[in-house]
Interface confidence: low
């Protein structure tokens, strides 16, 4: 029986040029993180692997850095970044828990929630 | 409003040693996650290590592998960066994140950061 639960940034959005984290939070579970795959759309991202560390897909490792923790940091925003990114927990025994988060690029000086989410 | 305050930068030779310290404050908060990030003048902000909560997942950049730790103190919301060995190029101003979950859900902060020159 699957007990998590996936907490998420939610809605988000950022300053075309800047640099935003994404990060999702597995609890209420004892279950064990054994992967994280990070996804936009149809595109993996980036994956964390308990054992193996990190990988970065080749067509992103200039824009997308690991962390802080199993989460992930996008640099360099476009506004063609805007859409939706999935955190894809694999989990032994519970399987697999997804959450989602909508990043909204934007071309004007001020972003909602910019404050919280931006990187200086 | 949760804030970060970096300490432990300076000027060290290399083959030197610094302790970072990255103290989280500030409201009914955890941390969920602390990294450490760096930018060398006139370079990209790199991620450096990070750290989930739990302790459990550890992430090093393969520059720094086998000469900088990463750990965290809970109970303080404290993240520490031990780097030995220091090299030239580890000269950078090096910036704490945070991910944490309070009240209002998940949230993530930066440090004004800390320099470190490593020169003889």
């Known amino acids: 029986m699957m007990t998590g639960t996936i907490e998420t940034t939610g809605n988000i959005s950022a300053e075309k040029g800047g640099s935003i984290i994404l990060q999702c939070h597995l609890s209420s579970t004892t279950a064990q993180v054994t992967q994280v795959n990070w996804e936009q759309q149809d595109q993996l991202l980036a994956i964390c692997n308990a054992d193996l560390g990190w990988h970065i897909s080749p067509s992103f490792k200039d824009r997308v850095a690991p962390g802080p923790g199993l989460g992930l940091t996008l640099q360099s925003l476009t506004v063609n970044d805007t859409g939706e990114y999935f955190c894809i927990y694999h989990t032994y025994p519970d399987g697999t828990y997804t959450g989602r988060i909508f990043l909204e690029v934007l071309e004007s000086s001020v972003a909602e929630h910019g404050a919280r989410f931006q990187i200086p | 409003e949760v804030q970060l305050v970096e300490s432990g930068g300076g000027l060290v030779q290399p083959g030197g040693s610094l302790r970072l310290s990255c103290a989280a404050s500030?409201?009914?908060?955890?941390?969920?996650?602390m990294g450490w990030f760096r930018q060398a003048p006139g370079k990209e902000r790199e991620a450096v290590a990070s750290?989930?909560?739990?302790?459990?997942?550890?992430y090093y950049a393969d520059s720094v592998k086998g000469r900088f730790t990463i750990s965290a103190d809970n109970s303080k919301n404290t993240a520490y960066l031990q780097m030995n060995s220091l090299k030239p190029e580890d000269t950078a101003v090096y910036y704490c994140?945070?991910?944490?979950?309070?009240?209002?859900?998940?949230?993530?902060?930066w440090g004004q950061g800390t320099l470190v020159t490593v020169s003889s």
């Open positions: 994140a945070s991910s944490y979950s309070s009240s209002s859900g998940l949230g993530d902060i």
């Open positions: 500030g409201g009914a908060f955890s941390t969920v996650a």
């Open positions: 750290i989930w909560r739990s302790g459990d997942s550890t």
